[in-house]
């Protein structure tokens, strides 16, 4: 009886009300192996999710999020609001980066700017809310009397240190 | 599986210095903020900052400002800490932990096993 | 700046339910994620609630988090406590998005 069952391609279930014959899967359900004794119910892409491939017999249906919103999590199991560049998520909503932060992105978290000094060179364009510094040669390479901009000691960040 | 691996306990002498790593696997190490945290004997968890590895970026709490130095070695996926002018208070278990990139409030998701370190003369 | 204040110790039965408090001094509580981590003797801490109400995977079902606007507070609740519960419970949030606050703790004993 096991091997009877084996022989049931996707898209159906081995119905053991029915001698265990292969029946195809019911509408809004799939098996995508062989051998199921049942189908899965196809997932539904409502609110927040938009249906990106439509449920077969065969494969479950795929969601994505709807405008203003982006995927989180395997198979995109979560949808997350998205911020303006220059923000980050938190629990009251989109937020501004803190001062000596930045994202490029409409979602993730803020970043600190890069650590010019670390490669022992120096800020040639200052970082904003919406984009990192831009390093440039180390001090010693400038010319005699050139300067480099350096952001302002950081005010409302207890020590942040984006150089 | 994600990992957090943090070097030996140490005992040190009062003005020195002493340097705890935290060797990070099984994650993109440059993509999440590692914090360093501090816990003294029978006391509650202290914050002392933070490192992006991705670009070196660090913060510092007020009261380890001058005295913590937070760096990452990102070919070994490691951060360090390391903290000068050691004083007897400063004898505590330290921790680095991640925090997912989800928002900007997260949790700290993975925890190193804790360093403990020792100051006295 | 933000301050999270907890009781030193909470004890409680076997089989009974505990609820460890976390206080916000100022603001409003719903505008905070507040996440509770659990830390035995000599161990590391570990995440039992996370963004106000989520349990991380294997984290049992009696572990549960909320929180009370009129109070501002938010709790961890511990349903049918058990002996191995007995521990020090931390919660945690941020003063801005780059630092984090934690609350005192509260040691867990079971009677």
């Known amino acids: 009886l096991q091997d009877l069952c084996s022989n049931c391609p996707a898209g159906t279930f081995c119905d053991n009300n029915r001698s265990q014959i292969c029946s195809p899967c019911p509408p809004n359900s799939f098996s995508s192996a062989g051998g199921q004794r049942t189908c899965d119910i196809c997932r539904q892409c409502k609110g927040v999710f938009k249906t990106r491939k439509e449920c077969s017999s065969t494969s479950n249906a795929e969601c994505d999020c709807i405008s203003g919103y982006h995927c989180l999590g395997a198979e995109c199991s979560m949808c997350e609001q998205d911020c303006k560049q220059g923000q980050e998520l938190t629990k009251k909503g989109c937020k501004d980066c803190c001062f000596g932060t930045f994202n490029d992105q409409k979602r993730g978290i803020c970043r600190p700017w890069t650590n010019c000094s670390l490669d022992g060179k120096s800020v040639l364009v200052n970082g904003t809310k919406e984009r990192d510094v831009v390093c440039g040669p180390s001090p010693a390479d400038l010319s005699p009397g050139a300067s480099s901009a350096t952001p302002p000691a950081p005010a409302r960040e207890p020590g942040h240190s984006p150089q | 599986e994600v990992q957090l691996v943090q070097s030996g306990a140490e005992v040190k002498k009062p003005g020195s210095s002493v340097k705890v790593s935290c060797k990070a696997s099984g994650y993109t190490f440059t993509s999440y903020y590692i914090y360093w945290v501090r816990q003294a004997p029978g006391q509650g968890l202290e914050w002392i900052g933070n490192?992006?590895?991705?670009?070196?970026?660090?913060f510092y709490g007020e009261k380890f400002m001058g005295r913590a130095t937070f760096t990452a070695d990102t070919s070994t996926s490691t951060a360090y800490m390391e903290l000068s002018s050691l004083r007897s208070e400063d004898t505590a278990v330290y921790y680095c932990?991640?925090?997912?990139?989800?928002?900007?409030?997260?949790?700290?998701?993975?925890w190193g096993q804790g360093t403990l370190v020792t100051v006295s003369s | 700046s933000v301050e999270l204040t907890q009781p030193p110790s909470v004890s409680v039965s076997p089989g009974q339910t505990a609820r460890i408090t976390c206080k916000l001094n100022?603001?409003?509580?719903?505008?905070?994620?507040v996440h509770w981590y659990q830390q035995k003797p000599g161990q590391a801490p570990v995440t039992m609630i996370y963004r106000d109400d989520k349990r991380p995977d294997g984290i049992p079902e009696r572990f549960s988090g909320s929180s009370d606007s009129s109070s501002n507070s938010a709790f961890l609740t511990i349903s049918g406590v058990q002996a191995e519960d007995e521990a020090d419970y931390y919660c945690?949030?941020?003063?801005?998005?780059?630092?984090?606050?934690f609350g005192g703790g509260t040691k867990l004993t079971v009677l």
């Open positions: 100022s603001g409003n509580i719903g505008s905070y994620y």
């Open positions: 945690h949030s941020y003063d801005s998005t780059i630092t984090p606050v």
């Open positions: 490192i992006w590895p991705g670009n070196g970026g660090t």
């Open positions: 932990a991640r925090r997912p990139d989800y928002s900007g409030d997260d949790y700290f998701d993975y």
